[in-house]
Interface confidence: low
C-alpha cells in the first residue's frame, strides 16, 4: 500500500493550561523506519516526540504504537503553555543501516494556537 | 500470558553488590519500558529505576542513585538491576514491572504488569 | 510523592472512589492494587483509565484537571486490599502515593 501521512487539522486552539490531541495516521508501516514530530520546518526545526522510549515531559502518545499494525501516531500535549505555539509536523523516515536515517514524507502540518486563559 | 520472572534475589551483606534479572515471556519484549519497584517491609511501593523499550534511555530513583545501574538484553528478553554498596534499608521485595503500549521507565502510570518479586535481605 | 487518603470505606454494592493528585504535567495516573503485604501487586488502571483484560469492568479510572480517581462499583468483599497510585514527576522520576486502605464493611 502506498505511504501517506494524514494529519486531518490544519489548525487546533487549545487554552494554556489544557490538553490537546495532534492527530497523524499512517497508510503503511513501510519502510521501516521511525515516526518523529517536529515543530517547525527547516534545519532549525524542533524535535518534540519520536516514539523512541524517552520521557518526554507533558508528551504521550495517544495509541498503542507497540502494536503489530498500529498506524495512529497521534500525540497529546498536557498542560500546553504559549511556547508550545508553532507548527506540528508529523514524519516518517526510512532506517538507515549506517547512514542517518532519511526523511521519506512529513503530513501537512498542524497549526496550534494557544489561548490566554 | 505475559509473565515477569524475578530472579537473583537472597542475603546480602552490607557494602556488596546484587544482581537481580527479570524474564520477560508472552509479549513482545523489545517493545516495551520496563521498571523495578521494591517495597520493603511493613512499608509502600517505592520506584527503584527504569528502562526504555531500546535501551538507550535509563532512569532512576533518588534512593539508588549513584549506586545502580539498569539494562536489558532484547535478545534474551531480559532486564537487569545492578545495586552497589547495599545498605540495610536496600532490604525489600523487588518487582519487575511491564509498560503498557504509553510511556517510558518512570512512567508508572503506564505499568500494566508485575512479577511475583524477589526477596532481597541485606544484613551482616 | 503523590497524594491519596490514607483509607476509605464501604458497603458491599455500593461506589468507591479514591483519588491522586500531584504528578507532574504529564497528568496520567495508574492504580494497583495489594491484597496483603509482601504479595505481588495487579494493575487495575493504567494510562488514567485503560484496564488490562484481566480486570473486571467495575473498576474505572478517570483524570479531571490534576487528579486522578479509581472508581469501584459495586464494591465486592475480594476488592478489600491497599490500592496504590503511581505516575511520574517532571523530571520523569517515578512516583506512588502512600497507599489507600479499602475496607469492604459487612
Known amino acids: 500500500k502506498e505511504l501517506k501521512v494524514t494529519q486531518p487539522e490544519k489548525s487546533v486552539s487549545v487554552a494554556a493550561g489544557d490538553s490537546t490531541v495532534l492527530n497523524c495516521t499512517l497508510t503503511s508501516l513501510l519502510p521501516v523506519g521511525p515516526i518523529r514530530w517536529y515543530r517547525g520546518v527547516g534545519p532549525s526545526r524542533l524535535l518534540i516526540y519520536s516514539f523512541a522510549g524517552e520521557y518526554v515531559p507533558r508528551i504521550r502518545n495517544v495509541s498503542d504504537t507497540t502494536k503489530r499494525n498500529n498506524m495512529d501516531f497521534s500525540i497529546r500535549i498536557s498542560n500546553v503553555t504559549p511556547a508550545d505555539a508553532g507548527i506540528y509536523y508529523c514524519v516518517k523516515f526510512q532506517k538507515g543501516s549506517s547512514e542517518p536515517d532519511t526523511e521519506i514524507q512529513s503530513g501537512g502540518g498542524t497549526e496550534v494556537y494557544v489561548l490566554a486563559k | 500470558a505475559v509473565t515477569l520472572d524475578e530472579s537473583g534475589g537472597g542475603l546480602q551483606t552490607p557494602g556488596g553488590a546484587l544482581s537481580l534479572v527479570c524474564k520477560g515471556s508472552g509479549f513482545t519484549f523489545s517493545s516495551h519500558a520496563m521498571n523495578w519497584v521494591r517495597q520493603a517491609p511493613g512499608k509502600g511501593l517505592e520506584w527503584v529505576a527504569g528502562?526504555?523499550?531500546?535501551?538507550?534511555?535509563?532512569y532512576y530513583g533518588a534512593a539508588v542513585q549513584g549506586r545502580a545501574t539498569i539494562s536489558r538484553d532484547n535478545g534474551q528478553s531480559t532486564v537487569r538491576l545492578q545495586l552497589n554498596n547495599l545498605r540495610a534499608e536496600d532490604t525489600a521485595t523487588y518487582y519487575c514491572?511491564?509498560?503498557?503500549?504509553?510511556?517510558?521507565?518512570?512512567?508508572?502510570?503506564?505499568?500494566?504488569?508485575w512479577g511475583h518479586g524477589t526477596e532481597v535481605i541485606v544484613s551482616s | 510523592a503523590l497524594t491519596q487518603p490514607a483509607s476509605v470505606s464501604a458497603n458491599p454494592g455500593e461506589t468507591v472512589e479514591i483519588t491522586c493528585s500531584g504528578g507532574g504535567s504529564n497528568n496520567a495516573y495508574g492504580w494497583f492494587q495489594q491484597k496483603s503485604p509482601g504479595s505481588a501487586p495487579l494493575t487495575v488502571i493504567y494510562d488514567n483509565g485503560k484496564r488490562p483484560s484481566d480486570i473486571p469492568s467495575r473498576f474505572s479510572g478517570s483524570k479531571s484537571d490534576s487528579t486522578g480517581t479509581l472508581t469501584i462499583t459495586r464494591v465486592q468483599a475480594e476488592d478489600e486490599a491497599v490500592y496504590y497510585c503511581?505516575?511520574?514527576?517532571?523530571?520523569?522520576?517515578?512516583?506512588f502515593g502512600a497507599g489507600t486502605t479499602l475496607t469492604v464493611l459487612g
Open positions: 528502562i526504555s523499550s531500546d535501551g538507550r534511555f535509563t
Open positions: 514491572t511491564k509498560n503498557g503500549g504509553c510511556g517510558s521507565g518512570g512512567d508508572l502510570d503506564c505499568i500494566d504488569a
Open positions: 503511581g505516575s511520574a514527576d517532571n523530571s520523569g522520576a517515578g512516583v
